[in-house]
């Protein structure tokens, strides 16, 4: 807390300019009018204030706006944003995408800070849903943003927003998140033709059910092994050798390199060795010839 002291004669600030960098902390407190600061916030960023001086400017704004800053001030905070705490930000009502962009720009190149996370949370909650423009902006600054959301939060993403998602935005998503995103992506891309559809849906396939994988196997998609390895194990297990061969196309020989990794390992264990041998890849671990396969889950359902 800076002491209240009178402003020395002739030092009263008439505008926010470079001369203020020579002011001591107490002089800034005494000589800069908070209302003037609020109207000329856009100038602060261009002036090389010290961190201590910025603390004083923040204090003045806090006194002027105890209930939270108006958006006209927030939009021009610049580096002063880095001085804000999550508690400060929770008082704000940010509705403009331009304001959000301006503040994200300040933090660009750094990991998402608690301040940024709070700002995004306030912004998205204010909008009611994660629309395409917002998602575009957020993933541009933070490629991993989408995967930082809970499945519940992701459920508020409208299918139209999925068009903004790039493959790298999904790199850190877990299966539960893809379970939510996949149906939205399927809906978003439903009017595309076969090959174009596959290019778009590929990144979301970690949430695809068996019947969709079977359908894809009929479309000559040539799925690569990196994508295949991300599929849900429970979705892969019911696929036949012929279906997997069609799904992977020329990439089918890659199964050998991944035969000990899930879901390939578990899928191999469910196939007849005879059928696996037709691939000519040397895959081992299938059900030996002459063995009867009982689907116990089916039997339980019937009893």
């Amino acid at each position: 807390e800076v002491e209240k002291t009178a402003c020395p004669s002739g030092k009263k600030a008439r505008e926010i300019d470079e001369s203020l960098i020579f002011y001591k902390k107490w002089e800034l407190e005494a000589c800069v009018d908070a209302a003037l600061l609020a109207t000329q916030m856009d100038r602060v960023n261009a002036i090389p204030f010290t961190y201590e001086q910025l603390d004083v400017l923040k204090h003045k704004l806090d006194e002027l706006y105890p209930q939270g800053y108006p958006e006209s001030v927030i939009q021009h905070l610049g580096y002063l944003f880095l001085k804000m705490s999550p508690e400060d930000i929770r008082k704000w009502n940010v509705t403009s995408l331009e304001t959000l962009k301006a503040l994200l720009e300040v933090n660009k190149g750094h990991e998402m800070s608690p301040q940024v996370a709070t700002l995004i949370d306030r912004f998205v909650k204010g909008r009611g849903q994660l629309d395409k423009d917002t998602l575009d902006t957020l993933t541009a600054f933070y490629p991993g943003y989408l995967c930082s959301l809970s499945p519940e939060e992701l459920s508020s993403v409208p299918p139209s927003s999925i068009w903004a998602v790039r493959p790298q935005d999904l790199d850190t998503c877990d299966p539960r998140q893809l379970d939510v995103l996949y149906p939205k992506a399927r809906l978003a891309f439903q009017n595309m033709n076969g090959s174009e559809y596959f290019v778009k849906i590929q990144s979301f396939l970690g949430g695809a059910p068996t019947e969709d994988l079977k359908a894809l196997s009929q479309q000559n998609v040539s799925m690569d092994l990196a994508t295949f390895m991300k599929l849900r194990t429970d979705a892969v297990l019911p696929l036949t050798v012929a279906e997997v061969q069609k799904l992977l196309g020329p990439h089918v020989e890659g199964l050998k390199a991944e035969e000990r990794h899930r879901p390939v390992r578990d899928w191999i264990l469910r196939q007849r060795q005879d059928d696996l041998d037709t691939l000519g890849l040397g895959l081992q671990g299938g059900i030996p010839n002459g063995y009867l396969v009982l689907d116990l889950s089916m039997q339980e359902a019937l009893s």
Epitope: A226, K230, A257, E259, R262, G282
Partner: antibody, heavy 119, light 108 residues
Framework: EVQLVQSGAEVKKPGASVKVSCKAS????????MDWVRQAPGQGLEWMGD????????IYNQKFSGRVTMTEDKSASTVYMELSSLRSEDTAVYYC????????????WGQGTTVTVSS | EIVLTQSPDFQSVTPKEKVTITCSAS???????LSWYQQKPDQSPKLLIY???NLASGVPSRFSGSGSGTDFTLTINSLEAEDAATYYC?????????FGGGTKVEIK
Amino acid sequence: EVQLVQSGAEVKKPGASVKVSCKASGYTFTDYNMDWVRQAPGQGLEWMGDINPSTGGTIYNQKFSGRVTMTEDKSASTVYMELSSLRSEDTAVYYCARRRIGTGYFDVWGQGTTVTVSS
Amino acid sequence: EIVLTQSPDFQSVTPKEKVTITCSASSSVISSYLSWYQQKPDQSPKLLIYRTSNLASGVPSRFSGSGSGTDFTLTINSLEAEDAATYYCHQWSSFPYTFGGGTKVEIK
């Protein structure tokens, strides 16, 4: 440019553990498995195991089972190899090597990390 | 596990001469699953040939590979000074993946 940059040399006492990191850059991290291969002084190459950075799934050479643990941090595009209960014969250069998912050959290697186990 | 035995262990060769290194497997290896690596002193290994005969990116055409079943060969058609290195064969046809013991090629 595709690069695998490993952590620096380590000197450990018998019975201790060592954790080597391998940071990947210049490619899509989740499209490639990361394998670990070691080379004892004046000896040949020995495959230790691999990790799929996308799923976190690991496969270990049985020779190291129970002693080796491979982990990944997708957000940092980094994989780790930890070897525990070290003995003098674990003295070696440890390499991480990139392997495209669906292939079995290593097209890019890290610079190697020398681990010396000595009392 | 499949044991890969390389021969010779060591070879001293004059430049421009042809070099042949063999890799013999203790049981059959599917040819798509065999590769060769080159390692120069104090350097990491480098992929030379994959799938028995495919040259890796940037590898000079004087290198070639062949073979099937249990017998595989790496050939350097006209040795150059920069080829002084140790060469390893590697199989991923059977778990665990294994490497040959290496063949050191020295320039006379």
